[in-house]
Interface confidence: low
């Protein structure tokens, strides 16, 4: 059966179809190319007679059209109103007919497009945004990317006019992006150049560091406010309420105990008339801000109730503090047996008792800072066993035996274990 | 996201050079036009030098011409702004900043690096 193939059948306006015939019948007197779907004489492109291999243009030929022998037909040039169809006539030697029709369409090369926005300085949480690809463009396909990916699904974006128009309503300073569009149609694709969508944000709550709280006397103090805003925010410094200069580094050096007081941090954006603020309390004091952790020494860890007493030492290297003593989380002294002495440094208990058993610590602290020891063992004995029952671990006392009448943690249990098993293989 | 990160400030004699950089992420800075803003205590924000890639043109305020020079490698995504013969009335806040072709404000700044000359 004779039939038309277009190649290609999207064709770009300026480019070239060939209408290729397929199952061209023997024994041809001739044949002719209308434009449109049937033979009509008004709309003759070509005819060709073999015979005399001449080719005659018809009323609908405009000088772009070429004819091969094998009847296919070229057509140069194209321009929109060469889309449609086109029918192949062709006359065999018996003056018998047939006939067959092929088709193309034509689409206009695109433009290089560009966008146009509705607002070039929204403001975060508050403003939309419009922005349109141009030009409008018949029978093409519009796209959007927004840092070269595809648009993210999200609610506050909504596309529009057959995708041509990208809103973003309520927009955040996380859409500050690269937008771009894109047209498509079967015969080519332009992207254009990005438009970075400028959100005007904040400023946030300002941030000041560093984050230290208390200075000594002497030191210099150097802070500095930051906050988040876009343009970037303007900033000023106030102590104790009173204005002190516009930076946004603040700067005294040699710093007294008059410098301490309330710093506040004043961030203004002008353009989004946004303003924040942020108070921090200096306090310059010879105490120490970090008090170090303690250590307690004891006389013995293990002792015989009723017989023996125990010293217990506090040991800090700083100055200016208070010690205070516990005893599974009593405050102590907490019996006629035990007293302070040294300022609190030592506790004694004289004599020892069973329930005076368990762990003890001690806290050191100013009126700005504290800290504690690690708990230390005190082990009562009321059985008179030989010393080789005791062995060491980790420079520390504990009983070796069952008598119960220790009062040790299972975490200590399981120490002794292995130090048994050490001790063993060492006799 | 859009980012700018500028860098390069510091404290500089009278008569010396320093030179800023300003590293883009999220776009291509050749799709744009970049400049260099600077913000001093009490005076007017003041654009002094901006390049624009796509269109092939760089232009300086009257207050820096021959002194600063603005430039940009497109495969680092980086603008530079190389600051000669530098004077006390240079110290600012150096702000990098995009110009989109959509209104060509430069309204998407950096956080900025400042520049102190003084002796």
């Known amino acids: 059966k004779l039939t038309i193939e277009s190649t290609p059948f999207n064709v770009a306006e300026g480019k070239e179809v060939l209408l290729l015939v397929h199952n061209l019948p023997q024994h041809l007197f001739g044949y002719s190319w209308y434009k449109g779907e049937r033979v009509d004489g008004n709309r003759q492109i070509i005819g060709y007679v073999i015979g005399t291999q001449q080719a005659t243009p018809g009323p609908a030929y405009s000088g772009r059209e070429i004819i091969y022998p094998n009847a296919s037909l070229l057509i140069q040039n194209i321009i929109q109103n060469d889309t449609g169809f086109y029918t192949l006539h062709v006359i065999k030697s018996d003056l018998v007919n047939e006939e067959a029709t092929g088709q193309f369409r034509v689409y206009p090369e695109l433009p290089k497009p560009s966008i146009s926005s509705n607002n070039s300085k929204p403001v975060e949480d508050k403003d939309a945004v419009a922005f349109t690809c141009e030009p409008e463009t018949q029978d093409a396909t519009y796209l959007w990317w927004v840092n070269n990916q595809s648009l993210p699904v999200s609610p506050r974006l909504q596309l529009s006019n057959g995708n041509r128009t990208l809103t973003l309503f309520n927009v955040t300073r996380n859409d500050s992006a690269s937008y771009k569009c894109e047209t498509q149609n079967p015969v080519s694709a332009r992207r254009s150049d990005s438009v970075i969508l400028n959100v005007l944000y904040g400023p946030d709550t300002p941030t000041i560091s560093p984050s230290d709280t208390y200075y000594r006397p002497g030191a210099n103090l150097s802070l500095s406010c930051y906050a988040a805003s876009n343009p970037p925010a303007q900033y000023s410094w106030l102590i104790n309420g009173t204005f002190q200069q516009s930076t946004q580094e603040l700067f005294i050096p040699n710093i007294t105990v008059n410098n301490s007081g309330s710093y506040t941090c004043h961030a203004n954006n002008s353009v989004t008339g946004c303003n924040r603020t942020t108070v921090k309390t200096i306090i310059v004091t010879e105490l120490s801000p970090v008090v170090a952790k303690p250590q307690i020494k004891a006389s013995k860890t293990t002792v015989t109730g009723d017989k023996d007493s125990v010293n217990l030492t506090c040991s800090t290297n700083d100055t200016g503090i208070s010690i205070r003593w516990f005893f599974k989380n009593q405050s102590l002294p907490s019996s006629e047996r035990m007293k302070l002495s040294q300022g609190n440094i030592t506790l004694s208990i004289n004599p020892v008792k069973r329930e005076d058993a368990g762990t003890y610590w001690c806290e050191v602290f100013n009126p700005i800072s504290k800290n504690q020891s690690d708990p230390i063992m005190l082990n009562v004995n009321y059985n008179a066993l030989p010393q080789e029952n005791l062995i060491n671990v980790d420079e520390q006392l504990y009983f070796q035996g069952g008598s119960g009448l220790n009062d040790i943690f299972e975490a200590q249990k399981i120490e002794w274990h292995e130090a048994r098993a050490h001790h063993h293989h060492h006799h | 996201e859009v980012q700018l990160v500028e860098s390069g400030g510091g404290l500089v004699q009278p008569g010396g050079s320093l030179r800023l950089s300003c590293a883009a992420s999220g776009f291509n800075i050749k799709d744009t036009c970049i400049g260099w803003v600077r913000r001093a205590p009490g005076k007017e924000e003041e654009l002094v030098a901006a390049i624009c890639e796509y269109k092939g043109y760089t232009r300086y305020a009257d207050s820096v011409k021959g002194r600063f020079t603005i430039s940009a490698d497109t495969s680092k995504n980086t603008a530079y702004l190389q600051m000669n013969s530098l004077r006390a009335e240079d110290t600012a806040v150096y702000y990098c900043?995009?110009?989109?072709?959509?209104?060509?404000?430069?309204?998407?700044w950096g956080q900025g690096t400042t520049v102190t000359v003084s002796s």
């Open positions: 900043a995009i110009a989109s072709p959509v209104d060509q404000y430069y309204n998407y």
